[in-house]
């Protein structure tokens, strides 16, 4: 029989559940722990102070608790302040709490004292340097100055001049005596340890204003813009460069060590980028404003003046043209030029054009032309309409035929084609 059915094994309201292994297990209500919920939960009373997290455990039939304390607190119930919180240990020493509740610092080598702030003078504790080396105390450590013939941190090794090699920049070390060496330097370097980069610029071949820049066993020439090549001996063809060396349509001509531009009208300067100020030589009359343009200028005239230089009186000021005509001034002589509206003619556009007498009759279909001021009218014959009698009047539009008769439009009249049994003009 399943174990949960043989009378519940769970005490204190624990709920019996069957595990996959067919064993019984108890799910305890708050306040109880243990296999059968038979023990009071020590965490239930909230024994951990502050924000301490309580964890209960059952060991040998007894319920116990432990507190996981937040930063800055310690003790079984997190009620004691943590002395390590203020980082009292210097120089990376490890901080722990002693039995008395105070901090303890585990000092790294070279430091001592309660907070590991005191430097240990290794030079006074015995003689760490061998073979007569001079001990020099340093913060947290010491250094040995070795006598000739010895090397190593404690002067413990007999010196080999080329191990490690003192030669720099790829130089090769050669031992020349017990304690001496020579460096065979790579090309471009010199000095006892090949530490000096030879200046290759004396006697350089940079021409045409090129500047020598030293390299390793070589040099480079920084050329002015008109020259190129390894030694600045190649002329730059500025006319091949993009963007064009000559602006605003100027023509480029390469020269040896430069170029020249032939500018189009209106432009000047080495690269044709300056617009010539044509107003500097312009003679706009007094009161006019000169505006520079490319290879030209424009005089903005004051009221009453006209002409290219504003040197003429504007004849249009006196309104010589008939109303609706457009007045312009001849820029050469200042006289008024009247542009007439339709229907008028004459120098001042004040003469009516008789449209009925010039050329063919403007009225179609024998309409009668009547001249009017600035225009004309057409009096149309019977059957025609429109401004020029151009439209045939459709007399059928008014639907004059009766009794489903068909209307035929004629010029100035209509005809009704009657259905059987009807007669009359309108088939009425």
């Amino acid at each position: 029989a399943p174990p949960c059915l043989d009378g519940s094994p769970c005490a204190n309201g624990g709920r019996c559940t069957q595990l996959p292994s067919r064993e019984a297990a108890c799910l305890c209500p708050p306040g109880w722990v243990g296999e059968r919920c038979q023990l009071e939960d020590p965490c239930h009373s909230g024994p951990c102070a502050g924000r301490g997290v309580c964890q209960s455990s059952v060991v040998a039939g007894t319920a116990r608790f432990s507190c996981r304390c937040p930063r800055g607190f310690r003790g079984p119930d997190c009620s004691l302040p943590d002395p390590c919180l203020s980082s009292p240990c210097a120089h990376g020493a490890r901080c722990s709490v002693g039995p008395d509740g105070r901090f303890l610092c585990s000092c790294p080598p070279g430091y001592q004292g309660r907070s590991c702030r005191s430097d240990v003078d290794e030079c006074r504790v015995g003689e760490p340097c061998r073979h007569g080396g001079t001990c020099l105390n340093t913060p947290g450590s010491f250094r040995c100055q070795c006598p000739a013939g010895y090397t190593g941190p404690l002067c413990e090794n007999p010196a080999v001049p080329c191990a490690p090699s003192p030669c720099r920049n790829g130089g090769t070390c050669r031992q020349s005596g017990d304690l001496t060496y020579d460096c065979a330097c790579l090309p471009g370097f010199e000095g006892q340890n090949c530490e000096v980069n030879v200046d290759d610029c004396p006697g350089h071949r940079c021409l045409n204003g090129g500047t020598c820049v030293d390299g390793v066993n070589t040099y480079n020439c920084q050329c002015p813009p008109e020259w190129t090549g390894q030694f600045c001996t190649e002329d730059v063809d500025e006319c091949q460069l993009q963007p064009n060396a000559c602006h605003n349509g100027g023509t480029c001509f390469n020269t040896l060590g430069g170029h020249s531009c032939v500018c189009v009208n209106g432009w000047t300067g080495e690269s044709c980028s300056q617009n010539i100020d044509d107003c500097a030589t312009a003679v706009c009359f007094h009161g006019a404003t000169c505006h520079d343009r490319v290879a030209s200028f424009y005089c903005a005239c004051p009221m009453g003046k006209t002409g290219l230089l504003c040197h003429l009186d504007d004849a249009c000021v006196s309104n010589p043209c008939h109303e609706d005509a457009i007045c312009d001034t001849n820029p050469v002589n200042g006289r008024a030029i009247c542009t007439c509206p339709p229907g008028f003619t004459g120098g001042a556009c004040d003469q009516d054009v008789d449209e009925c007498s010039i050329g063919a009759n403007p009225c179609e279909h024998l309409g009668r032309c009547v001249n009017t001021q600035g225009s004309f009218l057409c009096q149309c014959g019977r059957g025609y309409t429109g401004p020029r009698c151009e439209t045939d009047v459709n007399e059928c539009l008014s639907g004059p035929c009766r009794n489903q008769a068909t209307c035929l439009d004629r010029i100035g009249q209509f005809t009704c084609i009657c259905m059987a049994g009807f007669t009359g003009t309108y088939c009425e």
């Epitope: 045409n208 190649e234 091949q240 020249s260």
Partner: antibody, heavy 120, light 112 residues
């Protein structure tokens, strides 16, 4: 016919001066860059000076720099070479040459040459 | 300065036979902007030099097609496919890539 005609050569003492001329005809002289080239007796050719079409740009090799001056008068269609502080090694036939194009710097027209002899 | 070395210094050729002149420069004549400015001139006896070939291989106007130029970098060649009596004279190679512009020492061509 396109022609260059040099003149002004002659015998001059070391340290002396001479001015050579090159008269151009048959082409638009002001449109071309020009140079002087010399040829020592029985020797090769040596370029000695250059001037641009408008005269604004000149160039000399180290052998004559500071002693020779090239110039031109476009209104007279004439090229000049002023030679000062002449030395024995300046003895040569001096040719004026026209540059066909300022992109390639070769000489497409040469004069017939004028002889300069520097001797004491 | 760029030194131009011509070989041979003299050449005796049978009419109708080919001839070849070599020109070597002490530096590459390829300009940074791409072109190679190597030219050939002929100086006939008692005359001034005249242009034959410009920019390595371009025949100047009026130059017969028996003349041809080739090469690149530092090595260049002038070839005459069939030498004629009028081809006698001194041939000069010249470079205008680097200033100062320089000429070869010349190759004297004569007819056998």
């Amino acid at each position: 016919e396109v022609q260059l005609l040099e003149s002004g050569g002659g015998l001059v003492q070391p340290g002396g001066s001479l001015r050579l001329s090159c008269a151009a005809s048959g082409f638009a002289f002001s449109h071309y860059d020009m140079s002087w080239v010399r040829q020592a007796p029985g020797k090769g050719l040596e370029w000695v000076s250059y001037i641009s079409r408008g005269g604004g740009s000149t160039y000399y090799p180290d052998s004559v720099k500071g002693r020779f001056t090239i110039s031109r008068d476009n209104s007279k269609n004439t090229l000049y070479l002023q030679m000062n502080s002449l030395r024995a090694e300046d003895t040569a036939v001096y040719y004026c040459g026209r540059h066909a194009t300022t992109a390639y710097w070769y000489f497409d027209v040469w004069g017939q040459g004028t002889m300069v002899t520097v001797s004491s | 300065d760029v030194v131009m070395t011509q070989t041979p210094l003299s050449l005796s050729v049978t009419p109708g036979q080919p001839a070849s002149i070599s020109c070597r420069s002490s530096q590459s004549l390829v300009h940074t902007q791409g072109n190679t400015y190597l030219h050939w001139y002929l100086q006939k006896p008692g005359q001034s030099p005249q242009l034959l070939i410009y920019k390595v291989s371009n025949r100047f106007s009026g130059v017969p097609d028996r003349f041809s130029g080739s090469g690149s970098g530092t090595d260049f060649t002038l070839k005459i496919s069939r030498v004629e009596a009028e081809d006698v004279g001194v041939y000069f190679c010249s470079q205008s890539t680097h200033v100062p512009w320089t000429f070869g020492q010349g190759t004297k061509v004569e007819i056998k």
